[in-house]
């Protein structure tokens, strides 16, 4: 089941999927001056069996100017966009994306692909948030969003990340920064939020990406 909406946006933050659930589609978009080859796929699809998942179809771009070539054209100034990179705050041990069963890893780039990727997510997909450069997390609650199906409709959970540009915040005296609460989430909340363990895993995963591409567009 495809998710109806995009993941929620958080002020001064970006999001990214670390792995993509089976059923996810990625549009085969080409950069300006290029187009999909005739009879080429419209999208890539994450498919798999119980032991292995991979992307079906290949995206291929060809020059719009000449028919049967994939010769690179010099991009116009407005096309020479830098992909924004955001440094994560603390490096941790990597978590292998492929170790998540039923998920595909980030597809490798194809020649002359567009600067932004458009994904169509499915129920159960999780995306992770981080503050953009120049902002810091005032509150770092669960910094992820999950696409869930409730009452026959899809809905993304609301991430509880607050990013602030204010460097001077007051921390109350005599109190150390507490660790994340050890108790599990109460029953009333489990239908809407992932577990603390999942959050810890995602933090480790997210923190491995020292400089990540965060211009990806999700739909």
């Amino acid at each position: 089941e495809l998710c109806d909406d995009d993941p929620p946006e958080i002020p001064h933050a970006t999001f990214k999927a670390m792995a993509y659930k089976e059923g996810t589609m990625l549009n085969c978009e080409c950069k300006r001056g290029f187009r999909r080859i005739k009879s080429g796929s419209l999208y890539m699809l994450c498919t798999g069996n119980s032991s292995h998942s991979s992307w079906d179809n290949q995206c291929q771009c060809t020059s719009s100017a000449t028919r049967n070539t994939t010769k690179q054209v010099t991009p116009q100034p407005e096309e020479q966009k830098e992909r924004k990179t955001t440094e994560m705050q603390s490096p941790m041990q990597p978590v292998d994306q492929a170790s998540l069963p039923g998920h595909c890893r980030e597809p490798p780039p194809w020649e002359n692909e567009a600067t932004e990727r458009i994904y169509h997510f499915v129920v159960g997909q999780m995306v992770y948030y981080q503050c953009v450069q120049g902002y810091r997390a005032l509150h770092r609650g669960p910094a992820e969003s999950v696409c869930k199906m409730t009452h026959g409709k899809t809905r993304w959970t609301q991430p509880q990340l607050i990013c602030t540009g204010e460097m001077e915040t007051s921390q109350f005296p005599g109190e150390e920064k507490p660790q994340a609460s050890p108790e599990g989430r109460p029953e009333s909340e489990t239908s809407c939020l992932v577990t603390t363990t999942d959050f810890q895993i995602q933090t480790e995963m997210a923190a491995t990406m020292e400089t990540s591409i965060f211009t990806t567009e999700y739909q």
């Epitope: 509150h139 607050i162 994340a180 108790e183 989430r185």
Partner: antibody, heavy 115, light 107 residues
């Protein structure tokens, strides 16, 4: 179910301080930041500030800077808002509200400042 | 600070009417906007978040739309229990300011 329960009404003299509490239950307290909002009689809503229940960091509205202190006690899942140097214009109902989208609110605490 | 301006400040409508309340931000706030309903003597209640997402348990006659600076809360068919004051609020940046409120009365 999620609940935010606030302390009872207070009557204070000008110049005094008041400390309002807000106890969260039915969810993991440190997952959600806590905002404080007040409403003077017959007036609209006014955002006072926000505190991270996880780190204790707080940001206050400029208007209250120097007079307000927000704290949390994670062992009791309680957030506090203390307002000092009270004046008659601080007479209002004070609310705590949870998370990025203020999805749950306390019932409100009436603070009356009168000589 | 970002100013939030609601209109109208009050309105009276009949049961079954379609009611629209607008909120304008003094600068672009993307879709970082919430709508709340408040009844006399009660705490506000979240209706819509992120401009268009209906909060859990809110009847489907309520809907939110808009992005950037102009936002709308619509009640498709007014019910007697919909009276009260409606507030918009942004969460783009601190301070998270509210609109001045729209008082809705049932004719």
């Amino acid at each position: 179910q999620v609940q935010l329960v606030q302390s009872g009404a207070e009557v204070k003299k000008p110049g005094a301080s008041v400390k309002v509490s807000c106890k969260g239950s039915g969810y993991t307290f440190t997952d959600y930041a806590m905002h404080w909002v007040r409403q003077a009689p017959g007036q609209g809503l006014e955002w006072m500030g926000v505190i991270s229940t996880y780190s204790g960091d707080a940001i206050y509205a400029q208007k209250f800077q120097g007079r307000v202190t927000m704290t949390v006690d994670t062992s009791t899942s309680t957030a506090y808002m203390e307002l000092s140097s009270l004046r008659s214009e601080d007479t209002a109902v004070y609310y705590c509200a949870r998370g990025v989208t203020f999805d749950y609110w306390g019932q409100g605490t009436t603070v009356t400042v009168s000589s | 600070d970002i100013q939030m301006t609601q209109s109208p400040s009050s309105l009276s409508a009949s049961v079954g009417d379609r009611v629209t309340i607008t909120c304008r931000a003094s600068q672009d706030i993307s879709n970082y906007l919430e709508w709340y309903q408040q009844k006399p003597g009660k705490a506000p209640k979240l209706l819509v978040y992120n401009a268009k997402t209906l909060a859990e348990g809110v009847p489907s006659r309520f809907s939110g739309s808009g992005s950037g600076t102009d936002f709308t809360l619509t009640i498709s068919s007014l019910q007697p229990e919909d009276f009260g004051t409606y507030y918009c609020q942004h969460h783009y940046d601190t301070p998270y300011t509210f609109g001045q409120g729209t008082k809705l009365e049932i004719k």
